[in-house]
């Protein structure tokens, strides 16, 4: 079941999936001046069996000006840096989710890929949040959102990360320093 909505945006934070559940789709988008090859896939799909998951289909981009040239999928590390949704700015890796059964790793970039990846997530997908540069988390607890099915509708749980900037901190003297650093993450709740 696809999630109806995108993961929630929260102020001064970005999110990232560490791995993608089977059924996740990634649009084959090309950067400006390039387009999908005529017979090319619309999306990549995370599929698998009990022991192994991988991305089906390949995304291929060709110059809008040239009709015949095709560009194969080749990793381009420098392009990886451009994409908002595929980069994390800190070593936050709560779980090596890519090693979980039924999950695919981040697909390698393809040549002339668009700067931002568009994923279509499925129920059960988890994304992790972190504060953008210049902001810090108010506490050291879990910071994620999970796509769940509730009352027949899909919804993302509310991330519990609050990011604050220096200016805001000085306005709020009521902050007390964390005394502990609990591990774990919000438990799943019974709904309905």
């Amino acid at each position: 079941e696809l999630c109806d909505d995108d993961p929630p945006e929260i102020p001064h934070a970005t999110f990232k999936a560490m791995a993608y559940k089977e059924g996740t789709m990634l649009n084959c988008e090309c950067k400006r001046g390039f387009r999908r090859i005529k017979s090319g896939s619309l999306y990549m799909l995370c599929t698998g069996n009990s022991s192994h998951s991988s991305w089906d289909n390949q995304c291929q981009c060709t110059s809008s000006a040239t009709r015949n040239t095709t560009k194969q999928v080749t990793p381009q590390p420098e392009e990886q840096k451009e994409r908002k949704t595929t980069e994390m700015q800190s070593p936050m890796q709560p779980v090596d989710q890519a090693s979980l059964p039924g999950h695919c790793r981040e697909p390698p970039p393809w040549e002339n890929e668009a700067t931002e990846r568009i994923y279509h997530f499925v129920v059960g997908q988890m994304v992790y949040y972190q504060c953008v540069q210049g902001y810090r988390a108010l506490h050291r607890g879990p910071a994620e959102s999970v796509c769940k099915m509730t009352h027949g509708k899909t919804r993302w749980t509310q991330p519990q990360l609050i990011c604050t900037g220096e200016m805001e901190t000085s306005q709020f003297p009521g902050e007390e320093k964390p005394q502990a650093s609990p591990e774990g993450r919000p438990e799943s709740e019974t709904s309905c």
Epitope: E9, P11, F172
Partner: antibody, heavy 116, light 107 residues
Amino acid sequence: EVQLVQSGAEVKKPGESLKISCKGSGYSFTNYWIAWVRQMPGKGLEWMGIIYPGDSVTRYSPSFQGQVTISADKSINTAYLQWSSLRASDTAMYYCARGPYYFEYWGQGTLVTVSS
Amino acid sequence: DIVMTQSPSTLSASVGDRVTITCRASQSISSFLAWYQQKPGRAPELLIYKASTLESRVPSRFSGSGSGTEFTLTISSLQPEDFATYYCQQYKSFSWTVGQGTKVEIK
């Protein structure tokens, strides 16, 4: 089922102290922010402050800073709102709610009446 | 603090009417806005978050729109149980702030 259950109504005199409670159940209490919201008679909602029970990090709205204290005891899944010296203007309904950004679950409210 | 201003303060309407409530923020809050409904003697209930995302139990006659500084809550066809007070709340910047409320009453 997620539930927030608040302590009962209180009638107090000005200058007295008070601590009201909000007990969470049906979820991992330590991993979710709890906010306190005031509603004075016939008035709107005012966000007072918020606490993360896992490590007791607390933030207050500037309007309530120094007026109240928010705390939590994670061993009994309970958040508290307290006053050291009540005033008549503290008469209101007080709600706890699970956040941190928007509030999906609310307590039933605790009515605090301060009168001489 | 970001100031949230709702209009109108009171709205008289009949069952079946289309009702629109406006909420304005004193500065841009992107889509970090929630709407609540409160009935007398009851705790508020979340209707909408992220300006337009309907909470799972909320009937589809409710909808939210807007971004930046101007937002609207629309009830497409007012039902008897919808007579209540409605509040908008921003969560873009600490401290979260709430509009003064709009009371929807029977005409």
